[in-house]
Amino acid sequence: VIHVTKEVKEVATLSCGHNVSVEELAQTRIYWQKEKKMVLTMMSGDMNIWPEYKNRTIFDITNNLSIVILALRPSDEGTYECVVLKYEKDAFKREHLAEVTLSVKADFPTPSISDFEIPTSNIRRIICSTSGGFPEPHLSWLENGEELNAINTTVSQDPETELYAVSSKLDFNMTTNHSFMCLIKYGHLRVNQTFNWNTTKQEHFPDN
């Protein structure tokens, strides 16, 4: 099994590892499937691409019957199977079988924290946000290891790219020192950013 790892939105080339001459195409059926669902077929020279892959998949017949998937999505991750059937006597016989595992990475960048003052009060508001990752993120605010209540946390997903964006607000009393951590967990991964507030100097600085 061949393993291919790519970043989301990148291009992945999955090779069948087999060549068929132009003359042989008329007597050949080629199936690309992903986890038992069809991606692409070429039957005696007629090509068909399934709707989920249309307009973003190229079949490169001259390059080992590879499929090239453009603008990778998280849902493209999985095991692809290429089957080549060759007409022999009175039937199509399996001539070649190959498996390619595609991993699609979609890491959230380190979140950014912005802050602003709420007029005529001792309350300051900070906003933590990041976008462009997968799977669905879970954001929490921590201070000294204790979880805090955010004002509101919004998670949205782009239907086209399948990538998530997350944003969360936290209000705090600016008359005391604070060190807040914005922690984002997604799948088995996590990213975080720390916001420090120092009352004596009336300043903040994020950890990098």
């Epitope: 069809m38 039957m43 005696s44 020279g45 007629d46 068909n48 039937a91 016989k93 399996r94």
Partner: antibody, heavy 116, light 108 residues
């Protein structure tokens, strides 16, 4: 000589399920994709789907997804078609056929009648 | 999916008459992927013409097939009684595989 022997006629109640068999002679099913085709009374032919018996991969016409399930047992050299939640619309003759450039070999067909 | 439209749906021909059945395909396909089957009542379909113009084993030479792209036809040069049957065209260009609705040919 290639021959596809299908199981006998079935009379089944609405809502039930039925499993039809297709046992070839003259070839080993693991070397060929096996297809199923439906023909309702006085109607045309409808392709249901295929199975690659070697690895169990299947492909269905979307309109039969959830209704039909194609399986194969290479040890007994038999392909199966299971139909679930039967209604009068499923009353038909079901054929198995072997993949080729075209359907060169067909079973004799299994009539399925859905009736209360 | 690719839709195959056969015409006529029903026709009758006298012995010795020339018969043509057409099959119109909703999108262009390779001629090697268009096939014809003959079916008589209460029997399984039989392969009749494959790859547009090749006669299946045992098919009389009075039958012929032609066409390309989206337009295909089956022709009987001289109708005989045993030709009375239903004829179906079928495409193997893309999934789902599809058949025409059939042309019932009767003897006049």
């Amino acid at each position: 000589e290639v021959h596809l022997q299908q199981s006998g006629a079935e009379l089944v109640r609405p809502g039930a399920l039925v499993k039809l068999s297709c046992k070839p002679s003259g070839f080993n099913i693991k070397d060929y994709y096996m297809h199923w085709v439906k023909q309702r009374p006085e109607q045309g032919l409808e392709w249901i789907g295929w199975i690659d018996p070697e690895n169990g991969n299947t492909l269905y016409d979307p309109k039969f997804q959830g209704k039909a399930s194609i399986t194969a047992d290479t040890s007994s050299n038999t392909a199966y078609l299971q139909l679930s939640s039967l209604t009068s619309e499923d009353t038909a003759v079901y054929y198995c056929a072997r993949e080729g450039l075209f359907f060169a070999y067909w079973g004799q067909g299994t009539p399925v009648t859905v009736s209360a | 999916e690719i839709v195959l439209t056969q015409s006529p749906a029903l026709m009758a021909a006298s012995p010795g008459e020339k018969v043509t059945i057409t099959c119109s395909v909703s999108s262009s396909i390779s001629s090697s992927n268009l096939h014809w089957y003959q079916q008589k009542s209460e029997t399984s379909p039989k392969p009749w013409i494959y790859g547009t113009s090749n006669l299946a084993s045992g098919v009389p030479v009075r039958f012929s097939g032609s066409g390309s792209g989206t337009s295909y036809s089956l022709t009987i040069s001289s109708m005989e009684a045993e030709d009375a049957a239903t004829y179906y065209c079928q495409q193997w260009s893309s999934y789902p595989l599809t058949f025409g609705a059939g042309t019932k040919l009767e003897l006049k």
